[in-house]
Structures are given as C-alpha cells and as structure tokens.
C-alpha cells in the first residue's frame, strides 16, 4: 500500500525562493514521519528533511547546505526554499515515509516539480536610464 503524492508540475523562483507543497493521500496527524525533498532525476541530492512526531515539535534540516524551512498540514508538507541559485534549476521530488505506527509506509514516486530559478537581473529603470553612450 503506497501513499500518493501530488506536486505542482512547475514553479518559478523569481526572488531565489519558492514554496513547494507536497500533498499526500494520507493524514499525518498523530503519526511519526519523515518528509523529504530530493533534487535531480535520480533524486541524488536530499535537499531538505521535515521530521514530525506526535509528541515533539516539527524538526527541519538540510544536510546539503540548502536554506530550507517546512510547514505541516494534515495531509501536506510545504517546503520553503530560500537563497536558491540559477544552477539549482532542476526537478524536485517529494518523498514521505511513515515510521510509526507500523507498518512502514512510503509513497509512489511522484511526477516531481521543475523549479526554475530566475536570476536577479539588475535592469536599468526606464525612469533612470543611466549614462548615455558618447
């Protein structure tokens, strides 16, 4: 029995930050779980982890240097990624694992979300065009 995950097909990070919501066909209330976000087609980089426990505060961390935070809904986890670089444009996959109560459950691999990180372009304002060329 697998949990189904829904993600937006694509998100654009205009200000080098993005909220990626992972929606599950499973209620996480009073469960011990590990929700994670993985980068790349092969999910090789674990970007962020949200650990939830019925008796403890939510714990969020990244072992790979990403600036991330997480929020929990009954059937969702939202990852908030900040300080993204243009070269981190990639496909990102949500993963959910329920550790307790037994049996262990995880998800069918989702379709993923392409996060397109737009660089901050410092364009001259039309009101202040800057120095004209001689």
């Amino acid at each position: 029995n697998k949990i189904l995950v829904k993600q937006s097909p694509m998100l654009v990070a205009y200000d080098n930050a993005v909220n990626l919501s992972c929606k599950y066909s499973y209620n996480l209330f009073s469960r011990e779980f590990r929700a994670s976000l993985h980068k790349g087609l092969d999910s090789a980089v674990e970007v962020c982890v949200v650990y939830g426990n019925y008796s403890q505060q939510l714990q969020v961390y990244s072992k790979t240097g990403f600036n991330c935070d997480g929020k929990l809904g009954n059937e969702s986890v939202t990852f908030y990624l900040q300080n993204l670089y243009v070269n981190q444009t990639d496909i990102y996959f949500c993963k959910i694992e329920v550790m307790y109560p037994p049996p262990y459950l995880d998800n069918e691999k989702s379709n993923g979300t392409i996060i397109h990180v737009k660089g901050k372009h410092l364009c001259p304002s039309p009101l202040f065009p800057g120095p004209s060329k001689p």
């Epitope: 011990e32 590990r34 072992k63 307790y100 262990y104």
Partner: antibody, heavy 120, light 107 residues
C-alpha cells in the same frame, strides 16, 4: 531502559562464517537505523553496515561489501550481521549502535560489544 | 568518502587543565559532526552532536565549536574521569567516518 545487547562473537578460522545478533529493547525499533561499528585491537572506530528495519534498506562499508549481510527481524526487535569469508583484518570488537531514522547523524546508544577473532 | 583528521593523536594534561582537540573534515560537512568519549574496554559514549550541542547528561565542561571544516572539542577543566580516548565522527554522508582518535592521558 533503552538497551542494545550484542551476542555471537567468537573465534573463527580465515574463510569461516559467524552471525552476530543485536537485541534492541526500550525503544521503537522501526524509528531507528541499527548500525554495526567495529574496532580492531588498539585501533579506531570503523562503521561497517546499517539497516533501517522499517523498509529493510541497507548500507555497507566497501571493506565488507559482498561478504557481510545485515538484516533485521522486527518481530524480535533484533538485528543481525552475517559475516562470511572472514579475514584476519576482520578481527575486532563489534558494536551495535543506533541512529534515529528521522534525525540521522549521530550514534546515541551503544551495546557493550562482542569480540570476533579470525585466526588459524 | 569523507576523511576526518584528528589532532593531536595523544595528549598529556593535568586535572584542572583546559584541553582542546581538533578534527578536520576533507570536505564541507556543515554542522554534521559528533564527538564521542571511549574508555578502555567500554563502548563509546556520545558527548556532542551537530558540532556544538551537548548530549543529555554530559557535563557542561565539554563544549564543541565549528569554523568551516575545522571542529573543536574543548574540556574547560579536566576531571579525573575525563582521561579517555576521544573520537570525532561525520554524520553528513554515508559511509559515516570517524577520526583516528585522541588519547588523553594524565601528565
């Protein structure tokens, strides 16, 4: 009380086999990785293998890959290390330890260790 | 694999001394560094996790810090029970690896 208790160590000839056991108690077995870490006489600590009993995912150090097999029985809250094709350099005290599956970075509880001696 | 280089390999000190042990990672492991104490014939015990967090029940004379890929374990005032071997361990990437150990002896 949270406890890990190893057993199964002993003297074995090169090329022989041995199975170590690690009985866990006092915590939710499926919330933790179980690891084997060894220490050769007078040497430092070396991580050997790990298993997450929830989904039976395993990892091995290159030095034991293909020779050692880690497994777990959730009905008995026990992990095992099956050691085949043993070599003199496998001689060590073998410790069973745990790390949290959701917060996996340190080994917070250790067993007392079991001694494996590979010698002819 | 990530290499952990610990220094010094041995150290002589007296009760009441302030002692520092260093561990260097071969690549950036962020805060994912732990310290253990081991006494002869016994299993290691966790002292510090995530570079600077004191594990439950560990005396406050033990502390840890990080500067880039360099990590430090400090014992502010050595007690007789602190003479032991100390190991660092990286918990960022499998295979988890340990430093070679620092043996702290009585001067």
């Amino acid at each position: 009380e949270v406890q890990l208790v190893e057993s199964g160590g002993g003297l074995v000839q090169p090329g022989g086999s041995l199975r170590l056991s690690c009985a866990a108690s006092g915590f939710t077995f499926t919330s933790y990785y179980i690891h084997w870490v060894r220490q050769a006489p007078g040497k430092g600590l070396e991580w050997v293998a790990s298993i997450y009993p929830g989904n039976v995912a395993t990892r091995y150090a290159d030095s034991v890959k293909g020779r050692f097999t880690i497994s777990a029985d959730t009905s008995k809250n026990t992990a095992y290390l099956q050691m085949n094709s043993l070599r003199a350099e496998d001689t060590a005290v073998y410790y069973c330890t745990r790390s949290h599956y959701g917060l996996d970075w340190n080994f917070d509880v250790w067993g007392q260790g079991t001694t494996v001696t590979v010698s002819s | 694999d990530i290499q952990m280089t610990q220094s010094p390999s041995s150290l002589s000190a007296s009760v009441g001394d302030r002692v520092t042990i260093t561990c260097r990672a071969s690549q950036n492991i962020y805060v994912w560094l732990n310290w253990y104490q081991q006494k002869p014939g016994k299993a290691p015990k966790l002292l510090i996790y995530k570079a600077s967090n004191l594990y439950s029940g560990v005396p406050s004379r033990f502390s840890g810090s990080r500067s880039g890929t360099d990590f430090t374990l400090t014992i502010s005032s050595l007690q007789p029970e602190d003479f032991a071997t100390y190991y660092c361990q990286q918990g960022q990437t499998y295979p988890y690896t340990f430093g070679q150990g620092t043996k702290l002896e009585i001067k």
